[in-house]
Interface confidence: low
């Protein structure tokens, strides 16, 4: 067992070295590890195969260090982790496409709060098995198409706290089984209407704090699941363009919340679900 | 197989009581907000009630309101409808439906159920 | 009474084509709620249609369709078969209400 680490075995085999101001991926971490905790270090780089021996590792927590590079070989042969934690380290910037190919166990993913400013083509790809992506507090300002596209059994993505200027058409594809969706605290001004496609059982989306004057309905058409619908602090526009929003908003029976129009001056404030449809004049 | 299985239909006096329930299978029951439609022998289609899929928010249509109550047990994949002080007008085939359409928590109604004969009368 | 219109009846010759109106008003279509279509059969539960105006579920055949205009909406079918002989019910949700509201119905038949 590495010098700054505690290792046991039950409840499972763990390698637990937290805060130890550890600058590096210690040495000598037994290869029986199912459960390795290297959170709250020093560490700044994860270089290739650092955990190849641990081919029983499940969960491997490396959140809250300085980690700015991670080799894109660095969790080879970890084919039935579960868990990877790689959040806070806001250093990291970016992340080399391949490094998590082979982790076709992996059910949560944690990539928050690690400065990313755009998501690799094929990043996810072959993670199949992955539920929750945390992506939110990061510096991404878009969302290439077809990013999730592997993620069919992906039911939480958060991605709030971002600078998304755009949902594009193809950002969201393949998610089937997704349940929430938080885009909130974005500036997000533009969504295709057909970027909801695959979304059928979505039940929760935040889209508040954004940049939204308007929003196509088609969009929210595919949404047959939808519970609950933030759609406030944005600059809506309340004019007849807003009227198929309107529409939509007196039908849907789920809970969402206020929608304070920002334009025209005459309605700013009133919320769009409580107007009349002849307040939505112009065009 | 996505399937609805109305029952508890029956004859019942003016003024009495039934609980119809509904049965559903293939699809996430919680995911889907549920209606009751109506049919009397040989009208056209009404609705009745809805319910949103966590069973937080219930409709009414204007002729059964105060009478009628619309819930549903998740964890039993089933659907209710208790029908009070019932009328000689409210006899009709009673659908149950699932309402699939935008947010799935709205108006359009993909599959029904076979339904179950409610008749009011003395 | 019902909220949308339609007509009591309509008919046609096999490989003709027919259309079925559904009349609402400005709190209902024409506010911009979408309209559905449903087939039934005599002793039957009804069947969606037509969807969202003009959409339709996978199974049905194209020659069922949908449109809308204003506060009406009209179902067409074409090349009209045997089988198509059933009721037609277009619904929308009225604003004013609150509600779903149907339309009375349409008896096709097939001469």
């Known amino acids: 067992c590495p010098g700054a680490c505690v290792c046991y075995n039950e409840p499972k085999v763990t390698t637990s070295c937290p805060q130890q101001g550890l600058q590096a991926v210690p040495v000598g971490i037994p290869a029986a590890s199912q459960r390795i905790f290297l959170h709250g270090n020093r560490i700044s780089h994860v270089p290739a195969a650092s955990f190849r021996a641990c081919r029983n590792l499940t969960i491997l927590w490396l959140h809250s260090n300085v980690l700015a590079r991670i080799d894109a070989a660095a969790f080879t042969g970890l084919a039935l982790l579960e868990q990877l934690d790689l959040s806070d380290n806001a250093q990291l910037r970016s992340v080399d496409p391949a490094t998590f190919h082979g982790l076709g166990r992996l059910h949560t993913l944690h990539l928050d709060r690690c400065g990313l400013q755009e998501l690799g083509p094929g990043l996810f790809r072959g993670l199949a098995a992955l539920q929750y992506l945390y992506l939110q507090d990061n510096a991404l300002q878009a969302l290439p198409d077809d990013t999730f596209r592997d993620l069919g059994n992906l039911t939480h993505l958060f991605l709030h706290g971002n600078r998304i200027s755009s949902v594009p058409e193809r950002a969201f594809r393949g998610l089937h089984s997704l349940d929430r969706l938080l885009l909130h605290q974005n500036r997000v001004a533009h969504v295709h209407p057909h970027a909801f496609r695959d979304l059928g059982r979505l039940m929760t989306l935040y889209l508040f704090a954004n940049n939204l004057s308007a929003l196509p309905t088609e969009a929210l058409a595919p949404l047959r699941a939808l519970q609950y619908l933030r759609l406030n602090d944005n600059p809506w526009v309340c004019d007849c363009r807003a009227r198929p929003l309107w529409a939509w908003l007196q039908k849907f029976r789920g809970s969402s919340s206020e929608v304070p129009c920002s334009l025209p001056q005459r309605l700013a404030g009133r919320d769009l679900k409580r107007l009349a449809a002849n307040d939505l004049q112009g065009c | 197989e996505v399937q609805l299985l109305e029952s508890g239909g029956g004859l019942v006096q003016p003024g009495g009581s039934l609980r119809l329930s509904c049965a559903a299978s293939?699809?996430?029951?919680?995911?889907?907000?549920m209606s009751w439609v109506r049919q009397a022998p040989g009208k056209g289609l009404e609705w009745v009630s809805a319910?949103?899929?966590?069973?937080?928010?219930?409709y009414y249509a204007d002729s059964v309101k105060g009478r009628f109550t619309i819930s549903r047990d998740n964890s039993k994949n089933t659907l209710y409808l208790q029908m009070n002080s019932l009328r000689a007008e409210d006899t009709a085939v009673y659908y149950c439906?699932?309402?699939?359409?935008?947010?799935?928590?709205?108006?359009?109604?993909?599959?029904w159920g076979r339904g179950t004969l409610v008749t009011v009368s003395s | 009474q019902s909220v949308l219109t339609q007509p009591p009846s309509v008919s046609g010759a096999p490989g003709q084509g027919v259309s079925i109106s559904c009349t609402g008003t400005?709190?209902?279509?024409?506010?911009?709620?979408?309209v559905q279509w449903y087939q039934q059969f005599p002793g039957t539960a009804p069947k969606l249609l037509i969807y969202?105006?003009?959409r339709r579920p996978s199974g049905v055949p194209e020659r069922f369709s949908g449109s809308k205009s204003g506060t009406s909406a009209s179902l067409a079918i074409t090349g009209l078969r045997t089988e198509d002989e059933a009721d037609y019910y277009c619904?929308?949700?009225?604003?004013?209400?609150?509600?779903?509201?149907f339309g009375g119905g349409t008896k096709l038949t097939v001469l």
């Open positions: 439906a699932r309402e699939g359409g935008i947010l799935g928590a709205v108006d359009v109604f993909d599959i």
């Open positions: 293939g699809f996430t029951f919680s995911s889907y907000a």
């Open positions: 319910i949103s899929g966590s069973g937080g928010s219930t």
């Open positions: 400005t709190s209902d279509i024409g506010a911009g709620y979408t």
């Open positions: 969202d105006d003009y």
């Open positions: 619904q929308s949700y009225d604003n004013s209400l609150k509600n779903v509201v």
